[in-house]
């Protein structure tokens, strides 16, 4: 009688993460008597995946009724596959004894797992920066397999070229991560701009995955100030306005100084928004000319988004 053979017909099996993998194994004879065990890997460090005789293997089910006496099909199904399950699986026949001894192994089936990349996460600088400055954005995506992946950066639909990308680890692994850093030069018009990181992978049936960052969270556009004297309202009163233009974000505090002394402080509230996302605001000060004998230096001092104050002055002539 021919000696028992352990047949694993599939050299390799590929499965999508989250699915089940079926690993086929049949034996050609019922003799010798003894159980079948499945291992991942070979040698002393091999990992037991399934033991027909004993043990609890919650993710493994037998494809046929392996408890039947005449059964020769020892195929198994492993549920909820993850990249960590990749490897070569061996179906091994044991001879019954005390203890059971290994009799013959199948040639092995290599299980390869394809896994989608996670949604890319884009993060910008911790502190805001002003126009003309270069800022860095990072994009990360994890858990994909195989290793091949493409990553592109866009600013408002225009592809960026100044970036560096790494896929880790460099060698063989069950899954991979990608990390990319892009440099972006800010402009005054960038409040409404978006930076997009786009990741394409063989497993993606839809369009590439996208992560976005709004430059509104990164940019600070400092205000321009203009102080003007309005026509006299009443005989002794002059209206002076301070136009605060094109600033972002909205957080702004304005202080009026008369000859260096604080006259009034207010916080920007009813601002108007420009098309580019920046804000304008106007503050006015009513100066009683009759209270001053000499010329008055009026200063509009603005503290924007916690930055050092900027100011603009206006000399008010007091005619004798």
């Amino acid at each position: 009688e021919e000696e028992l053979q352990v047949i694993q017909p599939d050299k390799s099996v590929s499965v999508a993460a989250g699915e089940s993998a079926i690993l086929h194994c049949t034996v050609t004879s019922l003799i010798p008597v003894g159980p079948i065990q499945w291992f991942r890997g070979a040698g002393p460090a091999r990992e037991l995946i399934y033991n027909q005789k004993e043990g609890h293997f919650p993710r493994v089910t037998t494809v046929s009724e392996s408890t039947k006496r005449e059964n020769m099909d020892f195929s198994i199904s492993i549920s909820n596959i993850t990249p960590a399950d990749a490897g070569t699986y061996y179906c091994v026949k044991f001879r019954k004894g005390s203890p059971d001894t290994e009799f013959k192994s199948g040639a092995g089936t290599e299980l390869s797992v394809r896994a989608k990349p996670s949604a890319p996460v884009v993060s910008g600088p911790a502190a805001r920066a002003t126009p003309q400055h270069t800022v860095s954005f990072t994009c990360e995506s994890h858990g994909f397999s195989p290793r091949d992946i493409t990553l592109k950066w866009f600013k408002n639909g225009n592809e960026l070229s100044d970036f560096q990308t790494n896929v880790d680890p460099v060698g063989e692994s069950v899954s991979y991560s990608i990390h990319s850093t892009a440099k972006v030069v800010l402009t005054r018009e960038d409040v409404h701009s978006q930076v997009i990181c786009e990741v394409a992978h063989v497993t993606l049936q839809g369009d590439p995955l996208r992560g976005t960052a709004n430059l509104s969270e990164t940019i600070r556009v400092p205000p321009t100030l203009e102080v003007t004297q309005q026509p006299v309202r009443a005989e002794n009163q002059v209206n002076v306005t301070c136009q605060v233009r094109k600033f972002y974000p909205q957080r702004l505090q304005l202080t009026w100084l008369e000859n260096g002394n604080v006259s009034r402080t207010e916080t920007a509230s009813t601002v108007t928004e420009n098309k580019d996302g920046t804000y304008n605001w106007m503050s006015w000060l009513l100066v009683n000319v009759s209270a001053h004998r000499d010329d008055v230096k009026l200063t509009c001092q603005v503290e924007h988004d916690g930055q050092p104050a900027v100011s603009k002055s206006h000399d008010l002539k007091v005619s004798a």
């Epitope: 050299k11 390799s12 590929s14 499965v15 999508a16 390869s112 394809r114 195989p146 091949d148 992946i149 493409t150 394409a200 992978h201 063989v202 497993t203 993606l204 049936q205 839809g206 369009d207």
Partner: antibody
Framework: VQLVESGGRLVQPGTPLTLSCTVS????????MGWFRQAPGKGLEYIGI?????SPYYASWVNGRFTISKTSTTMDLKMNSLRSEDTATYFC?????????????WGPGTLVTVSS | DIQMTQSPSSLSASVGDRVTITCRAS??????LAWYQQKPGKAPKLLIY???FLYSGVPSRFSGSGSGTDFTLTISSLQPEDFATYYC???????????FGQGTKVEIK
């Protein structure tokens, strides 16, 4: 799971034509789909794909001559100003469940003949 | 664009023969290569994907190997139903485009 192409016929050069691929047994919103063609006695040629979310991508030679679109159960290939060299059997196909690098389900094809 | 060069363009073989068809890519496509079988008047049928994975329901006499630029389809023992034309198809993960080889016709000797 089935794909069936339709719309192929004899047309004169310069005429537009739209081919349809009707799917059953799966959802077009879950898979990338592709169009291919094969001129008589020649090899297979890739035309373009449409992603599960509806974005089309084309082979570099297409140059705007063809447009791929889809509804919930059909994928269309709109061909403008046909030429004699467009005479071919046109196939639609679905990519595999593991990824977009291969096509595991194909329709039987529909023949387009461009001749005056 | 990537070019795929298949060889031979045709071959004659007998039932039971071992048949090998090769496909070479003009640049690396890693393992993104599929093999199809096509019979006259029919649609292509997938045999192998990812260079070496046998598609469900395909007889085990078909096998694929290779990675990078050089790939092989092997039929270990040719059967009467295997007389057909075979195509390789690449997918390039950067351009996300597909290219076919020109085909290999396997005829009865």
């Amino acid at each position: 799971v089935q794909l069936v192409e339709s719309g192929g016929r004899l047309v004169q050069p310069g005429t537009p034509l739209t081919l349809s691929c009707t799917v059953s047994g799966f959802s077009l919103s879950s898979y990338v789909m592709g169009w291919f063609r094969q001129a008589p006695g020649k090899g297979l040629e890739y035309i373009g794909i449409i992603s599960s979310s509806g974005s089309p991508y084309y082979a570099s030679w297409v140059n705007g001559r063809f447009t791929i679109s889809k509804t919930s159960t059909t994928m269309d290939l709109k061909m403008n100003s046909l030429r004699s060299e467009d005479t071919a059997t046109y196939f639609c196909a679905r990519v595999g469940p593991l990824g977009v690098d291969y096509f595991n389900i194909w329709g039987p094809g529909t023949l387009v003949t461009v001749s005056s | 664009d990537i070019q795929m060069t298949q060889s031979p363009s045709s071959l004659s073989a007998s039932v039971g023969d071992r048949v090998t068809i090769t496909c070479r890519a003009s640049q690396s496509i890693n393992s993104y290569l599929a093999w199809y079988q096509q019979k006259p008047g029919k649609a292509p049928k997938l045999l192998i994907y990812s260079a070496s994975f046998l598609y469900s329901g395909v007889p085990s006499r078909f096998s694929g190997s290779g990675s990078g630029t050089d790939f092989t389809l092997t039929i270990s023992s040719l059967q009467p139903e295997d007389f057909a034309t075979y195509y390789c198809q690449s997918w390039h993960y950067i351009s996300r485009s597909y290219t076919f080889g020109q085909g290999t016709k396997v005829e009865i000797k």
